[in-house]
């Protein structure tokens, strides 16, 4: 906490500019008007303040806005955002996607910090759902964002937002998350034709039930083994040898390399040896 001291004569800051970098902490506290700072926040980022000086500026804003900063200030926080605690951020009401982008830009290239997580949480809760534009923005900055959400949080994602999801955004999702996302994806892509539909739905198939896999096997989709290995074991087990052969197409020979891995291992054990032999891969049930 900086002690309250009078501003020396001639030092009162008429505006936020580079001359302030030469001010001591107590001078910043005494000579910079908090309201002026709030209206000229966009200038702060262009000035090479020390971390200690930034602490003083934050303190001034905290005093001016004890209930939380207005969005007009938040949007221009820049590097001052890194000084905010999750507790500070919980007081904010961020509704503009531009504000969100501006703050995510400050943290770009770093892991998702507790501050960023709190910011995103506040933003999404304020919007009521994870709409397509928000999801687009969040996955652009954090490809693993979607998979960091709980199944309960994912249930608030509307099917229309699924169009924003890229395959890499689902890389770290577990089966419980895909169970929630798959029906949404199925709904979102339902009007696409066979081959286009498969390209879009492929990344979500870890949540697909047996009947949908059986349906896909009738559509010449040629599923690769990487996708097949992500399928739910309980969804794969009821498939016949003929259905798996149709589902994988030319990739069926890849079953050999994965014969000891789930779900292939468990599926093989469910099949009659005569049926497996028709594949000519040397699979032993």
């Amino acid at each position: 906490e900086v002690e309250k001291t009078a501003c020396p004569s001639g030092k009162k800051a008429p505006e936020i500019d580079e001359s302030l970098i030469f001010y001591k902490k107590w001078e910043l506290e005494a000579c910079v008007d908090a309201a002026l700072l709030a209206t000229q926040m966009d200038r702060v980022n262009a000035i090479p303040f020390t971390y200690e000086q930034l602490d003083v500026l934050k303190h001034k804003l905290d005093e001016l806005y004890p209930q939380g900063y207005p969005e007009s200030v938040i949007q221009h926080l820049g590097y001052l955002f890194l000084k905010m605690s999750p507790e500070d951020i919980r007081k904010w009401n961020v509704t503009s996607l531009e504000t969100l982008k501006a703050l995510l830009e400050v943290n770009k290239g770093h892991e998702m910090s507790p501050q960023v997580a709190t910011l995103i949480d506040r933003f999404v809760k304020g919007r009521g759902q994870l709409d397509k534009d928000t999801l687009d923005t969040l996955t652009a900055f954090y490809p693993g964002y979607l998979c960091s959400l709980s199944p309960e949080e994912l249930s608030s994602v509307p099917p229309s937002s699924i169009w924003a999801v890229r395959p890499q955004d689902l890389d770290t999702c577990d089966p419980r998350q895909l169970d929630v996302l798959y029906p949404k994806a199925r709904l979102a892509f339902q009007n696409m034709n066979g081959s286009e539909y498969f390209v879009k739905i492929q990344s979500f198939l870890g949540g697909a039930p047996t009947e949908d896999l059986k349906a896909l096997s009738q559509q010449n989709v040629s599923m690769d083994l990487a996708t097949f290995m992500k399928l739910r074991t309980d969804a794969v087990l009821p498939l016949t040898v003929a259905e798996v052969q149709k589902l994988l197409g030319p990739h069926v020979e890849g079953l050999k390399a994965e014969e000891r891995h789930r779900p292939v291992r468990d599926w093989i054990l469910r099949q009659r040896q005569d049926d497996l032999d028709t594949l000519g891969l040397g699979l032993q049930g």
Partner: antibody
Amino acid sequence: EVQLQQSGPELVKPGASVKIPCKASGYTFTDYNMDWVKQSHGKGLEWIGDINPNTDDTIYNQKFNGKATLTVDKSSSTAYMELRSLTSEDTAVYYCSRRLIGTGYFDVWGTGTTVTVSS
Amino acid sequence: QIVLTQSPAIMSASPGEKVTLTCSASSSVISTYLCWYRQKPGSSPELWIYSTSNLASGVPARFSGSGSGTSYSLTISSMEAEDAASYFCHQWSNYPYTFGGGTKLGMK
């Protein structure tokens, strides 16, 4: 560019353990299994086992059961192999190698980590 | 487990000479499930030939692979200095996956 970066040489005492990281970059980590191979002067190349990064499902060469433990951290695209109860027999170069799911050949190999077990 | 025996263990060849390395399996291997790696001293192995006869990316066309059942081979139609290395065959037809002992090929 696809790379599998392994850590530098390790000198460890008999009975100790060592954990070797293999940091993958330049490809989708979950589309490939990660296999581990031992290369020693006496025995040539030996397959230790593999892990599927999607399911953490592992398969081991029986010879290395209880000796090696394979794990992955999807968030950092890193595979690990821990070797325990080390003896002079475990002195070797250990490689991680990626294997496209559905194939059995290793199309990219790691830089190799030399483990020397000596008191 | 399937034992892969490579012969010769060590050999050298003159520039332009045709070279054949062999890999013999203790029991039958499906040809899709056999491949070859090349390793230069101080370097990691690299995939050279997969599925018995398919050249990996960047492998010169003077290399070829053939075989079936228990007998496989790698052939260099015309030896060049950069081909000096160790070559290992590898099968994934049966668990555990196994490798041959290698052939160390030198330049005369």
